[in-house]
């Protein structure tokens, strides 16, 4: 498949045209625009797909004012100015107005919760499988196998800092070099990036609102595997980070400090606990080989228990099983030695819902994976209609203009690295670059701010989840101090690494760019943001790692084509853009690939067909269960759920109206509302209504 | 109280074999090993083997391998060591001595057998 | 078999001395060593197990120290019915092996 599908035989700016005139759908754009709007969008589209990549003929097709999908959208405020209110009028205001923010910190609140819970069930789910990949004895020659352990394993735990303490300790009981550990601090780096995305699906609802949430979403995954792409080469080859990390290591006097401090757990875990507990010390017993752990449950039962430890003798069939000759003795008949043996009293059980069920932790853990992604889905929905409702005219003027306006001239370079300290700074709070990036994803939805800011505050918020895990490490017993302060420093670097090679310079910005044609084309197909995070965070891991197993020849054998061809797509891409009189007539475009390698159309029927069968039912679902059937199924008429598809069906072969254009409405009220059926100041309400 | 009764002296001609016993009263007699040692006139102590009567299980001491024999009859919590192809220089006092749990030093011991052999 | 080396084989001494006997062991028993004292015409009695511990109902002047191959047995003031033979134990492997014995005798 060509790597801007579609994109090819049009036009050389894939932020604007992809898929197509795909980009010329407007976000949110203003009612009278929308009312306006006719299918003759569509007429373009084919214009643009059969001109060459490199023609100059799209110009003419053009508008003369282009609508940009990245563009912010205007929320217009349809409420009565407060000058214009009386006092009671004002006063019922004022108390509408504290009651969303109780309402947006109450949801905010239970979103943040809801992450915590996702975590643990993953771990649930998948942790003891995680534990697993890090007893695998190549991972200290092979640090592609170790990147994808860390992708995998973060991605199965939901947590970097589950996986890095996993890491750490291996590397403090010499299981783990530091040289094999840094290449999965990187792939932790990448796994950690998921939870962001899996939160993007949910505003799959609305095309706009996906777009730019999806994009993002997925700046923060671009900047870690393009990261991880220079930077993993230039550490197997110069190992510069272990270097730098060494030497920071060896010049301080490090003391003990304390542990990080724990600010917005504070808060969470009290309901959190009241949940689930788990014993994460299990997953780091698997890594490291413990065959007791592997039937231990991660459930915690037991929160208070007594460890006593004391010396017993016991009987061993020679004096050389003794634990030394010093200890070692007879009783005339049997040889005697004598062992450490800790004994744990249960004091008190744990006080959550599954202390009591002693089910096995795949139940517990999908039970809780439905329940937290349904809170998450619930809360998210719920965010974005409050916000959505606040956010208006005035006060959204001011905040956008806040957070996305530059400094003044000469300055306004500056204001990326203070958005990256903010970013950092925040991330530092909330103890979670996941909790910071997620949470700033439905912002990006719904327009407040935008990709280019957000790019800086993400990149921010991976150098805040370094310094937490620095603070962690500096404040770990004496004999993981080390190890682990090299380990979070690595993370730093790498980061800060990173952010040298893919921030300062606009042009390199390439992020940026990849996430939003990523946007563009989950936006057209939905289905391909699922698709998306199935590739990049399960099956190209689970890949490499599987032909890491077969061996480095293998894996030699397999890379080396796959990656010649990516390179040679690339240049080819390239050259078709930039200079395409070189290129033979043939490949001035890729017309010569049959379609279901350049275009996504041909997917796109097939996954159609596929999810069909709950096209007809899916808007019946629930409203909070409709959004997850319509990223599968694809339908822009999902998001209305009060009625069943029958109807819908009908109001839209009364219409005529395409179902996967992009051009056209992105649910079935907005599209009877540009007839006059609707009252426009419902249709925003009715689309995202739980 | 614990309390370890033996047999009587015995007088034995070269050759011949000897069964001591040791009738033992106040304690749990399976939990404990049996001892037997022995001390010539005037001569230091010399172990002979142990018995375990909750097994039957023994441990000898190579210099009396082949010659000795422990058993224990726990209906009787009473232990017996016997000692065949007597020679003169077998001639001495044998006590049983009960093993205190886990280790090989020996708290209560019985008042002695004195074997005399002689032709 | 380990042997054990008990001196001095025969000790004069007066009501009140401090005694002291040591027990040199052919190779490393640990702490596993027992100390017995033996009246004429009497069973052993245990005194001393794990070369420090006292066994119950022995009087706190009886001690015993050491580890290793060197062990030493103390009276910190003797008493009349203390001159009897004292013997050496090693549990540490079989055979379990005695000291030849030291003889406290009356000054």
């Known amino acids: 498949m060509a790597p801007w599908p579609e994109l090819g035989d049009a036009q050389p700016n894939p932020d604007k045209y992809l898929e197509g005139a795909a980009g010329q759908q407007p976000t949110a754009p203003d009612k009278s625009k929308e009312t306006n709007k006719t299918d003759n969008t569509e007429a373009p589209v084919t214009k643009i797909e059969l001109l060459p990549s490199y023609s100059t003929a799209t110009l003419i097709d053009e508008p003369t004012e282009v609508d940009d999908p990245w563009n912010l959208p205007t929320l217009q405020d349809s409420g009565i100015k407060w000058s214009e209110r009386d006092t009671k009028g004002k006063i019922l205001c004022f108390f509408q107005g504290i009651g969303r923010l109780i309402l947006l910190l109450g949801f905010l609140y239970f979103f943040v919760c809801s992450l915590d819970i996702l975590s643990s069930a993953f771990q649930l789910v998948g942790g003891k499988m995680a534990g697993q990949f890090f007893s695998n004895s190549s991972i200290m020659s092979n640090p592609l196998l170790g990147l994808v352990i860390g992708v995998l394993v973060t991605v199965l735990v939901q947590s970097s800092s589950t996986s890095t303490s996993i890491v750490v300790s291996m590397v403090s009981s010499s299981l783990l070099t530091v040289r094999a550990a840094i290449p999965i601090i990187m792939g932790a780096n990448i796994g950690t990036s998921i939870t962001n995305t899996i939160v993007a699906l949910m505003q799959v609802g609305d095309r706009s609102e996906f777009r730019r949430a999806f994009a993002g979403a997925t700046v923060h995954d671009f900047f870690n595997w393009l990261s991880v792409l220079v930077l993993l080469p230039v550490e197997v080859a110069t190992h510069y980070l272990e270097i730098i990390t060494q030497l920071i290591v060896e010049s301080f006097h490090f003391k003990n400090g304390e542990d990080a401090p724990d600010l917005l757990k504070v808060i969470t875990k009290p309901f959190t606990k009241l949940i689930v507990q788990l014993d994460k010390k299990v997953i780091s017993q698997i890594a490291m080989n413990d065959e007791k752990a592997k039937n231990k449950s991660l459930v915690k039962i037991w929160c208070k228990t007594f460890t006593n430890k004391t010396q017993i003798n016991v009987t061993v069939p020679s004096t050389a099983n003794c634990t030394s000759p010093s200890l070692c003795w007879t009783d005339g008949i049997q040889n005697w030695t004598m062992k450490n043996v800790t004994y744990k009293e249960n004091i008190a059980k744990c006080q959550h819902i599954f202390v009591n069920f002693h089910l096995p932790d795949l139940a517990v853990g999908t039970i809780l994976l439905i329940l937290s992604l349904l809170v998450l889905c619930g809360c998210l929905i719920m965010i974005v209609k409050i916000l959505g409702s606040v956010l208006k005219g005035q006060v959204a003027t001011v905040i956008k203009k806040t957070i996305n306006t530059d400094f003044p001239f000469p300055f306004a370079w500056l204001t990326g690295y203070l958005a990256i300290l903010v970013g950092a700074g925040m991330t530092f709070i909330v103890q979670s670059s996941s909790v910071f990036t997620s949470a700033l994803t439905p912002l990006i939805g719904i327009g407040v701010i935008t990709i280019e800011r957000a790019y800086p505050l993400t990149l921010g918020s991976n150098i805040g989840t370094t310094t937490t895990a620095i603070l962690a490490a500096l404040a770990s017993p004496g004999n993981a101090l080390r190890s682990s302060l090299q380990i979070a420093l690595c993370h730093f670097f790498f980061n800060i690494s990173g952010i040298l090679l893919w921030y300062p310079i606009p042009f390199t910005r390439l992020p940026i760019r990849m996430a939003k044609g990523l946007g563009n084309i989950s936006a057209k197909y939905r289905w391909f943001a699922v698709f998306y995070l199935i590739i990049f965070f399960f099956l190209i891991p689970l890949t490499v790692f599987g032909l890491s197993l077969a061996g480095w020849r293998v894996l030699v054998g397999v890379g080396v084509p796959v990656v010649f061809i990516i390179i040679l797509v690339l240049c080819l891409r390239l050259l078709q853009s930039r200079c395409p009189r070189v290129l033979p007539k043939k490949l001035q475009n890729w017309n010569f690939l049959p379609l279901w390698m350049r275009s996504l159309k041909p997917w796109d029927a097939v996954v159609s067909k596929f999810t069909g069968c709950f096209q007809m039912r899916c808007c019946c679902c629930c409203r909070v269960c409709c959004r997850a059937c319509c990223l599968l199924c694809d339908c822009p008429k999902c998001c209305r759920c009060s009625k069943c598809c029958e109807d819908l069906e009908e109001a839209q072969e009364g219409q005529d109206v395409p179902v996967k254009a992009p051009e056209t409405f992105d649910n079935i009220t907005i599209s009877r509302e540009a007839q006059g059926e609707v009252p426009a100041s419902d249709s925003k309400t009715e689309c995202t209504a739980l | 109280q614990v309390q370890l009764v033996q047999s009587g002296a015995e007088v034995k001609k070269p050759g011949a074999s000897v069964k001591v016993s040791c009738k033992t009263s106040?304690?749990?007699?399976?939990?404990?090993?049996m001892h037997w040692v022995r001390q010539a006139p005037g001569q230091g102590l010399e172990w002979i083997g142990a018995?375990?009567?909750?097994?039957?299980?023994?441990a000898y001491n190579q210099k009396f391998k082949g010659r000795v024999t422990m058993t224990a009859d726990t209906s009787t919590s009473t232990v017996y060591m016997e000692l065949s192809s007597l020679r003169s220089e077998d001639t001495a006092v044998y006590y049983c001595?009960?093993?205190?749990?886990?280790?090989?030093?020996?708290?209560?011991w019985g008042q002695g057998t004195l074997v005399t052999v002689s032709s | 078999d380990i042997q054990l080396t008990q001196s001095p084989s025969f000790l004069s001494a007066s009501v009140g001395d401090r005694v002291t006997i040591t027990c040199k062991a052919s190779q490393d028993v640990g702490t596993a060593v027992a100390w017995y004292q033996q009246k004429p015409g009497k069973s052993p009695k245990l005194l001393i197990y794990w070369a420090t511990t006292r066994h119950s109902g022995v009087p706190d002047r009886f001690s015993g120290s050491g580890s290793g191959t060197e062990f030493t047995f103390t009276i910190s003031s003797l008493q009349p019915e203390d001159f009897a033979t004292y013997f050496c134990q090693q549990y540490s492997s079989n055979p379990l092996t005695f000291g030849q014995g030291t003889k406290l005798e009356i000054k």
């Open positions: 106040g304690y749990t007699f399976t939990t404990n090993n």
């Open positions: 001595a009960r093993g205190m749990y886990g280790h090989g030093a020996m708290d209560y």
């Open positions: 018995i375990y009567p909750g097994s039957g299980a023994t």
